[in-house]
Interface confidence: low
């Protein structure tokens, strides 16, 4: 099948980094300087991404496959393959149309990027607050009051915190 | 400063063809996406489309898709948008608009955008 179709088709035998060039008899012609390709059988070659502006490249063109960029310092990619540098805030910030603003009480976050996510409620899992949060860091739960009494055997390790993103119900 | 200058709207009957053109002129024009939009009385701003900033790559809003084509020249610094088949609905005020180096929000959403043309209207 495949020595079948190459007989009709001869731009079938071009491989990944040419093109199969109709005004020259459908030769395999390579691509041009800042151009890919990156399967075979391709009838043009697309044009390279350049990272340019808030962009940086993280892996440069080559004849086979794409640019990929990556943003510079200050900024973090958003959207599929880096579409998108979105600006940094501090931690205890988040980015808001007006630039970055702290988190409001009784909220934090601790990454420079995302939102600001409300502080777990220890006492949704009958804990008692071990450590106060901030705006960068979420609350330490810490062991319930009654786990603290004299005749209590154990201590009760503090609950792990909170995925990411998970606020409490 | 950063200007963008539309001209070519008008009165076009349906079925009809019209060709926008954007200027630009104090920025790198070719580092930028750019994107067109458009507003009918009483809605919200509607993305229209988007063209990379070397022309490499585009998105449009299934509405216009097939009928709009979207180019840039970026030796002229101008962003055109050819209006193919036109209906009664693509009646509004059509803008052109620079992408930001960064946003929050999606490639067709109105805030992804810095610097707005003074718009055309097109009936």
């Known amino acids: 099948f495949e020595r079948t179709r190459s007989l009709q088709d001869p731009c079938s035998n071009c491989p990944a980094g040419t093109f199969c060039d109709n005004n020259r008899n459908q030769i395999c012609s390579p691509c041009p300087p800042n151009s890919f390709s990156s399967a075979g059988g391709q009838r043009t070659c697309d044009i390279c991404r350049q990272c340019k502006g808030v962009f940086r490249t993280r892996k440069e063109c080559s004849s086979t496959s794409n640019a990929e960029c990556d943003c510079t310092p200050g900024f973090h990619c958003l959207g599929a393959g880096c579409s998108m540098c979105e600006q940094d805030c501090k931690q205890g910030q988040e980015l808001t149309k007006k630039g970055c603003k702290d988190c409001c009480f009784g909220t934090f976050n601790d990454q420079k990027r995302g939102i600001c996510r409300p502080w777990t409620n220890c006492s949704l899992d009958g804990k008692s607050v071990l450590v106060n949060g901030t705006k960068e860091r979420d609350v330490v739960c810490g062991p319930s009051p009654a786990d603290l009494s004299p005749g209590a055997s154990s201590v009760t390790p503090p609950a792990p915190a909170r995925e990411p993103g998970h606020s409490p119900q | 400063q950063v200007q963008l200058v539309q001209s070519g709207g008008g009165l076009v009957q349906p079925g009809g063809s019209l060709r926008l053109s954007c200027a630009a002129s104090?920025?790198?024009?070719?580092?930028?996406?750019m994107a067109w939009f458009r507003q009918a009385p009483g809605k919200e701003r509607e993305f229209i489309g988007r063209?990379?900033?070397?022309?490499?790559?585009?998105d449009y809003a299934d509405s216009v898709k097939g009928r709009f084509t979207i180019s840039r020249d970026n030796p002229k610094n101008t962003l055109y948008l050819q209006m193919n088949s036109l209906k009664p609905e693509d009646t509004a005020v059509y803008y052109c608009?620079?992408?930001?180096?960064?946003?929050?929000?999606?490639?067709?959403?109105?805030?992804?955008?810095?610097?707005w043309g003074q718009g055309t209207q097109v009936t």
């Open positions: 104090g920025w790198a024009f070719d580092n930028y996406g």
């Open positions: 063209l990379a900033w070397n022309g490499g790559s585009t």
């Open positions: 608009a620079r992408q930001r180096s960064y946003s929050r929000y999606g490639i067709r959403a109105p805030q992804t955008y810095d610097y």
